[in-house]
């Protein structure tokens, strides 16, 4: 069976600055030279694309300039960082990996990483 398994952590807590990082690792059944990584957010039954990047193996992962994601790749592992998160963005973030070239195409979808985001408390006014 030539299936592609994708692994990602079950839970990640975003930093107080609204930044969350996690690793998306895939077991490639072939020798892909072009890979597409997409981060999906599932909330209830709604699925939205958070960001996506296509990269050539051995090269850096490049998201669009206005993307809230950044990342680096190393072999079959992608280190993803999502920034600008707020409490309302808490949810399940799913890593989708596609081996685009050469044929055959393969799809792999992770089980998702539950990212918890806690908005920082505003600093209390000082009496001093």
């Amino acid at each position: 069976c030539k299936a592609m398994h994708v692994a990602q952590p079950a839970v990640v807590l975003a930093s107080s600055r609204g930044i969350a990082s996690f690793v998306c690792e895939y077991a490639s059944p072939g020798k892909a030279t072009e890979v597409r990584v997409t981060v999906l957010r599932q909330a209830d039954s709604q699925v939205t694309e958070v960001c996506a990047a296509t990269y050539m193996m051995g090269n850096e992962l490049t998201f669009l300039d206005d993307s809230i994601c950044t990342g680096t790749s190393s072999g079959n592992q992608v280190n993803l960082t999502i920034q600008g998160l707020r409490a309302m963005d808490t949810g399940l973030y799913i890593c989708k990996v596609e081996l685009m070239y050469p044929p055959p195409y393969y799809l792999g979808i992770g089980n998702g990483t539950q990212i918890y985001v806690i908005d920082p408390e505003p600093c209390p006014d000082s009496d001093f």
């Epitope: 069976c1 999906l40 195409y105 799809l107 979808i109």
Partner: antibody, heavy 118, light 106 residues
Framework: QVQLVESGGGVVQPGRSLRLSCAAS????????MHWVRQAPGKGLEWVAV????????YYADSLKGRFTISRDISKNTLYLQMNSLRDEDTAVYYC???????????WGQGTMVTVSS | EIVLTQSPGTLSLSPGERATLSCRAS?????LAWYQQKPGQAPRLLIY???SRATGIPDRFSGSGSGTDFTLTISRLEPEDFAVYYC?????????FGQGTKVEIK
């Protein structure tokens, strides 16, 4: 709303060419793989081709032997299927379908009928 | 190429009855979908990932299975459920469909 509308079908003689179009609306066209699937009269579904995202990578069913070409125009939100050297066995309803976020074909057009006959 | 074999070819049932449709793959598949098609209409996605219901699909439709054996169950057939059902694998190219199971009124 999210919609796919095919056009370009009709009756054509064997050996001739035809180009099908699929107009997409209601979603970001470049964020999805787009497929063509066909269905011969009274038969099942047969996958034909896919074009990915920016349109560079394309895959075809082996049975088509290079006669069909899939393409997309992102500026027009339109998917195409150029069919050359048509044969009787290409007679079918041709559907365009969106490869959804999780990979399955979540949105389908209404289909366009192609009849190859002399 | 992964070959999907559906059984039975035709299922004759009455409204209110339970329908069980089978799809067997020639090799293990990771991603399997089910579609419903009514005469003169395009297919409609019912189930993806073997068991997840697509948006707007009633909960009387359920999918199960893994590896090479998959099942679509319609718990209580409604008049609008009489149609042809196709399974499909979509985890790698080429994408393939089963030959279909027709659910008809007995």
């Amino acid at each position: 709303q999210v919609q796919l509308v095919e056009s370009g079908g009709g009756v054509v003689q064997p050996g001739r060419s035809l180009r099908l179009s699929c107009a997409a609306s209601g979603f970001t066209f470049s964020s999805y793989g787009m497929h063509w699937v066909r269905q011969a009269p009274g038969k099942g579904l047969e996958w034909v081709a896919v074009t990915w995202y920016d349109g560079r990578n394309k895959y075809y069913a082996d049975s088509l032997k290079g006669r069909f070409t899939i393409s997309r125009d992102i500026s027009k939100n339109t998917l195409y299927l150029q069919m050359n050297s048509l044969r009787d066995e290409d007679t079918a309803v041709y559907y365009c379908a969106r490869g959804g976020s999780y990979g399955a074909f979540d949105i389908w057009g209404q289909g366009t009928m192609v009849t190859v006959s002399s | 190429e992964i070959v999907l074999t559906q059984s039975p070819g035709t299922l004759s049932l009455s409204p209110g009855e339970r329908a069980t449709l089978s799809c067997r793959a020639s090799q293990s598949v990771s991603y399997l979908a089910w579609y419903q098609q009514k005469p003169g209409q395009a297919p409609r996605l019912l189930i993806y990932g073997a068991s997840s219901r697509a948006t707007g699909i009633p909960d009387r439709f359920s999918g199960s299975g893994s590896g090479t054996d998959f099942t679509l169950t319609i718990s209580r057939l409604e008049p609008e459920d009489f149609a042809v059902y196709y399974c499909q694998h979509y985890g790698s190219s080429p994408w393939t469909f089963g030959q279909g199971t027709k659910v008809e009124i007995k």
